[in-house]
């Protein structure tokens, strides 16, 4: 039975040209996290494998940095980065947990700076 829950940063906003940390946290389970996939719509951004380490998809390697922790840092944001992001936790023995984050990249300084995990 899957007892865990994923906490995420929820809906966040950031300024064009800035950076943002996407963060998820799996709680309420003793399942072992084997791998976390970060995806944007149907595109794989990065993988954090507990044993094999981080892999950043080649098309994103200039703008995506691993961490902190199992999170992902997006840099040099553009308006096109607006959209849904998913953290997919592959665990044993529970199976797969998925968290959703919606990022809005704003043109000017109207972005909220109070969001958790955000880089000023």
């Amino acid at each position: 039975m899957m007892t865990g829950t994923i906490e995420t940063t929820g809906n966040i906003s950031a300024e064009k040209g800035g950076s943002i940390i996407l963060q998820c946290h799996l709680s309420s389970t003793t399942a072992q996290v084997t791998q976390v996939n970060w995806e944007q719509q149907d595109q794989l951004l990065a993988i954090c494998n507990a044993d094999l380490g981080w892999h950043i998809s080649p098309s994103f390697k200039d703008r995506v940095a691993p961490g902190p922790g199992l999170g992902l840092t997006l840099q040099s944001l553009t308006v096109n980065d607006t959209g849904e992001y998913f953290c997919i936790y592959h665990t044993y023995p529970d199976g797969t947990y998925t968290g959703r984050i919606f990022l809005e990249v704003l043109e000017s300084s109207v972005a909220e700076h109070g969001a958790r995990f955000q880089i000023p």
Epitope: Q32, T34, Q35, N37, E39, N49, D51, L52, Y92
Partner: antibody, heavy 127, light 107 residues
């Protein structure tokens, strides 16, 4: 730090038996699949056998099927390879290795790569 | 059984040069391919998994590419410690198989 230490190798006559052990430390042994790989002198690598984390499934190379048995004792953090009816062509350095699991989100299946290896133990089958 | 054929058998190069090693599978292994490095008297070391992903601690000069039946390991600029034997391995299905190896030696 993951450590794998093989033992039990030596010189044995054709047709006789030998049991290799692999003592594991530095990780949760019961959570990982384990494998045996061998390398004949001056030759390449040959996969010998695999066993799932809980010992429920075992897989063998055709060259050893029916003669070799892989097993594990999770309470002792130890992997074994029982080798019977040994032949000259079984002469090799035998390595144990721990798999690392990778989830392929395209084909929706796990793959197992041999990330951590012991230093090997030499088995010589000779009369 | 899936047969992996590595070429060339030996590659003679100088430090600083680029090394390109090939591995061809007798049938598709998708991206379920690994590359290992082995030095004399040592156990193999995992370099690349899933055809193109570097394992933890592997320098960026090592890169893998390919899928299906044709795969390549590239060492962008050879360091003295890179002279060794390299093996490809498929983990697509049992029996798991290794290629015959490519020896990268100092010219």
């Amino acid at each position: 730090e993951v450590q794998l230490v093989e033992s039990g190798g030596g010189v044995v006559q054709p047709g006789r038996s030998l049991r290799l052990s692999c003592a594991a430390s530095g990780f949760t042994f019961e959570s990982y699949g384990m494998v045996w790989v061998r390398q004949a002198p001056g030759k390449g690598l040959e996969w010998v056998a695999s066993i799932l984390y809980d010992g429920s499934n075992r897989y063998y190379a055709d060259s050893v099927k029916g003669r070799f048995t892989v097993s594990r004792d999770n309470s002792k953090n130890t992997l074994y390879l029982q080798m019977n009816s040994l032949r000259a062509e079984d002469t090799a350095v035998y390595y144990c290795a721990r798999v690392s699991y990778y989830y392929d989100s395209v084909e929706l299946r796990w793959a197992e790569y041999f990330q951590h290896w012991g230093q090997g133990t030499l088995v010589t089958v000779s009369s | 059984e899936i047969v992996l054929t590595q070429s060339p058998a030996t590659l003679s190069l100088s430090p600083g040069e680029r090394a390109t090693l090939s591995c061809r599978a007798s049938q598709s292994v998708s991206s379920y391919l690994a590359w290992y490095q082995q030095k004399p008297g040592q156990a193999p070391r995992l370099l690349i998994y899933d055809a193109s992903k570097r394992a933890t601690g592997i320098p960026a000069r090592f890169s893998g590419s390919g899928s299906g039946t044709d795969f390549t390991l590239t060492i962008s600029s050879l360091e003295p410690e890179d002279f060794a034997v390299y093996y490809c391995q498929q983990v697509h299905n049992f029996p798991l198989t290794f290629g015959g190896g490519t020896k990268v030696e100092i010219k």
